[in-house]
């Protein structure tokens, strides 16, 4: 018997579509071999109609396709606009039609149900609204208008113009009679239920002169849309439920084993703790549509999701819904990166952010997830240089190491920095990832003066002590600006006394500014890195004042003041609009903070070429 498997019989009606899924053993040979859908003729030959190599026969042109899913060992043949001529015997298979692996499929296309002449067909999703149009003649204008539902041989009154409403339709149906001259009345049914499905009859007047019109109402429960996303990646559910529920509370829920639906997030402020730090419900548009983004996808996120609208913020029968089936692919293209990064108060973290390597030119962003209400993620930094004012001097986004990873460094950590952060770009939204920063007990490894006042025209020497464990790392000093951190020349000065229990490899790296200029004022970072991986950083603020006493100035930790908690920016610097992320396309609207410090110029502070390429990594 053939190892290929599929539906033995497929039946449908004219004008409809079918989707035929065929399964095959997913060996490497099978995954890459030709897939086909062919029709068996009287001669026994099987004529190809569509294949995975792009062939589509003339009578399938524009209405059929074949998609291979090698990771699942399936391929799907979609055929639209079916006609009765499509009825027949087919094969789905692999390899060559005549001697490959195949499965026989019988397709039967029928005319569809016989409906009374002139019947209007209304096809509407459950929970939505239908408007049934009922024409009448002038002589029936003053007479009673009514809508009946045909159940078997009987007709049950649903609504009429004498204010009768069938209890099954209470509070969700209305009959509208237009002004004079318009010979049509309408019946509007809201929040359609599956039980509303069936044949209806409009009637105006009575006796032999009455006007009648048949309406076939087909109420469909939306079948789940299939969504395949990668482990560790991101999924966006776009939910458009219609204007009728634009002002009603919205929700996303996940169907559980009891067939009820657990709220994942809603607009009333409810959120499932399993999605803490990795979910946003983006504000709805005027048309009532909204979207939910979930990042850091896990295998256990798989399942059926429904979005809907109801004043309670949860699923209720007869209200509109949309459905998705989420599959999380474990063979992910998104590389593993730490989901939790730990730092100590006063210390730093370096976070690795993956992005689609095909989109190296995309803008990169980092935002802070906030859980209030529907969740939001105000941007903190972006690759073009925008940095939130309160992060000045302690946050930088680096393009390195490149090739699918960028790095974000945050230093001068406080307990307030603990939380969830998102890495994202203005490109492939599926590569949004989440990292949690935790502040733990401990001391920073790098020691720099708290803050420094330099004298104009003199020499300034800033020491940075590092422990022996960093002896093999590359050390650097850089001058921070909101567009990055420009590397400066620095020198190793041998052993340091800052670490008592350390061998001779404990060292000091210092930065010398000679002579100090006004442009030198600003934030400086001392850091370590190893190949592609950035390690810890420490920041020091240098203020420049007028010359008072001649001579050079050497700053040691003993003389240093405490680091300022926050530098007050010039009043001319505009604050960044604290805008939550909704769509990366909106990022361009962010206001950019003016550069608070020019890069030090001249030969005094040339860029250390060894540090511009091989960077990246994460310090835990």
């Amino acid at each position: 018997k053939s190892p290929v498997f599929g539906p033995q019989e497929v039946s449908s009606v004219e004008g409809n579509s079918v989707s035929i899924k065929c399964y095959y053993p997913p060996t490497s040979v099978n995954r890459h071999t030709r897939k086909y859908w062919c029709r068996k003729g009287a001669s026994g030959r099987c004529i190809t109609l569509v294949s995975s190599e792009g062939y589509v026969s003339s009578n399938y042109a524009g209405r059929a396709n074949l998609t291979n899913f090698p990771e699942n060992g399936t391929f799907v043949v979609n055929i639209a606009q079916l006609s009765r001529d499509d009825s027949g015997h087919y094969k789905c298979g692999l390899g060559i039609n005549s001697r490959g692996l195949s499965f026989d499929v019988s397709l039967e296309v029928s005319q569809g149900p016989e409906l009374p002449n002139g019947t209007e067909v209304y096809t509407v999703d459950v929970g939505r609204t239908v408007t049934i149009k009922c024409p009448f003649k002038t002589e029936n204008a003053p007479k009673t208008k009514a809508l009946y539902k045909k159940i078997g041989q009987t007709s049950v009154l649903v609504i009429d113009s004498r204010n009768y409403v069938n209890p099954n339709y209470k509070d969700r149906i209305r009959l509208r009679i237009p002004g004079t001259g318009q010979l049509i009345f309408t019946v509007v049914i809201d929040r359609l239920r599956l039980s509303d499905h069936g044949l209806y009859l409009c009637q105006a007047g009575d006796g032999s002169n009455r006007d009648e019109k048949n309406a076939d109402l087909q109420v469909l429960e939306p079948e789940p849309e299939l969504v395949y996303e990668d482990l560790r990646g991101s999924v966006t559910f776009h939910c458009a439920l219609g204007l009728e529920v634009a002002n009603v509370a919205k929700f996303l829920c996940r169907v559980n084993s009891r067939e009820t639906c657990d709220v994942v997030i809603n607009t009333l402020g409810k959120r499932d703790s399993a999605f803490e730090g990795r979910i946003l419900l983006n504000p709805q548009d005027k048309d009532g549509s909204f979207s939910v983004v979930i990042t850091g996808l896990r295998k256990e996120d798989e399942g059926r999701y429904l979005c809907g609208a109801h004043s309670d913020g949860q699923l209720q029968e007869g209200w509109p819904i949309q459905a998705w089936q989420l599959f999380v692919n474990e063979e992910s293209t998104i590389p593993r990166s730490p989901t939790v990064v730990k730092g100590v108060a006063g210390g730093s973290v370096a976070v690795l952010c993956p992005y689609n390597p095909k989109e190296s030119q995309s803008l990169k962003y980092w935002c802070l997830w906030e859980g209030a209400q529907n969740g939001r993620c105000p941007l903190l930094v972006e690759s073009q240089g925008l940095v939130q004012e309160q992060y000045e001097g302690r946050l930088s986004l680096l393009q390195e190491p490149g090739n699918g990873t960028f790095t974000v460094i945050l230093n001068q950590l406080t307990t307030q920095d603990a939380g969830f952060y998102w890495c994202l770009t203005n490109g492939d939204t599926r590569w949004r990832t989440t990292v949690e920063i935790k502040i733990i007990e401990g001391e920073p490894n790098l020691k720099v003066p708290g803050n420094v006042t330099a004298v104009l025209g003199e020499t300034l020497n800033i020491p940075c002590h590092f422990p022996c464990k960093f002896s093999s790392y590359e050390k650097y000093w850089c001058k921070w600006s909101n567009t990055g951190c420009q590397t400066l020349p620095s020198q190793d000065e041998g052993p340091s006394e800052a670490f008592v229990n350390c061998d001779e490899n404990s060292r000091l790296v210092s930065l010398t500014l000679n002579p100090v200029t006004r442009a030198d004022e600003g934030w400086y970072w001392c850091g370590v890195k190893q190949g592609h991986f950035y390690g810890e950083t420490a920041a020091v603020y240098v203020a420049v004042e007028e010359k008072k006493v001649a001579g050079s100035r050497y700053v040691s930790p003993a003389k240093a003041d405490a680091a300022p908690d926050e530098k007050v920016l010039d009043s001319g610097v505009r604050e960044i609009e604290n805008k939550a992320i909704q769509d990366p396309r909106l990022f361009a609207e962010e206001k950019v903070v003016a550069d608070t410090g020019d890069q030090a110029g001249g030969s005094r502070a040339s860029v250390d070429s060894s540090s511009s390429e091989e960077q990246g990594g994460s310090s835990k």
Partner: nanobody
Framework: QVQLVESGGGLVQTGGSLRLSCAAS????????VGWFRQAPGKEREFVAA??????????YAADSVKGRFTISRDNAENTVYLQMNSLKPEDTAVYYC????????????????????WGQGTLVTVSS
């Protein structure tokens, strides 16, 4: 919760016929797929037949061992799925289980037990020689 109740099992002679019924009740969501599985004494549960419906289209599946002998069908109005079993053989002796799931075409392989969220208690079919 969706409840599934099987009926129609019994004792039949080789070559005889039986019709099994699977009635669904209490469903919160529409069921889009129903499968029949069987478990013979001392053996693992195996796939027999399944039906998926999507809009106006219906897809029927059958295991090689029952092709041409067993037919699956459904009665929409009654919320019932039937398994018509003809030309029965002693090797068809087993407890027959009905399974259902709200996931239709997008769902997993119909032959996989994990593709069904709801199961009935089973009905015994004995084919004597």
């Amino acid at each position: 919760q969706v409840q599934l109740v099987e009926s129609g099992g019994g004792l039949v002679q080789t070559g005889g016929s039986l019709r099994l019924s699977c009635a669904a009740s209490g469903r919160t969501f529409s069921v889009y797929r129903v499968g029949w599985f069987r478990q013979a004494p001392g053996k693992e549960r195996e796939f027999v037949a399944a039906v998926i419906w999507s809009g106006a289209s219906t897809y029927k599946y059958a295991a090689d061992s029952v092709k041409g002998r067993f037919t699956i069908s459904r009665d929409n109005a009654e919320n019932t799925v039937y398994l018509q079993m003809n030309s029965l053989k002693p090797e068809d002796t087993a407890v027959y289980y009905c399974a259902a799931d709200p996931l239709g075409l997008p769902g997993p392989d119909v032959r996989v037990e994990g593709g069904y969220r709801h199961w009935g208690q089973g009905t015994l079919v004995t084919v004597s020689s």
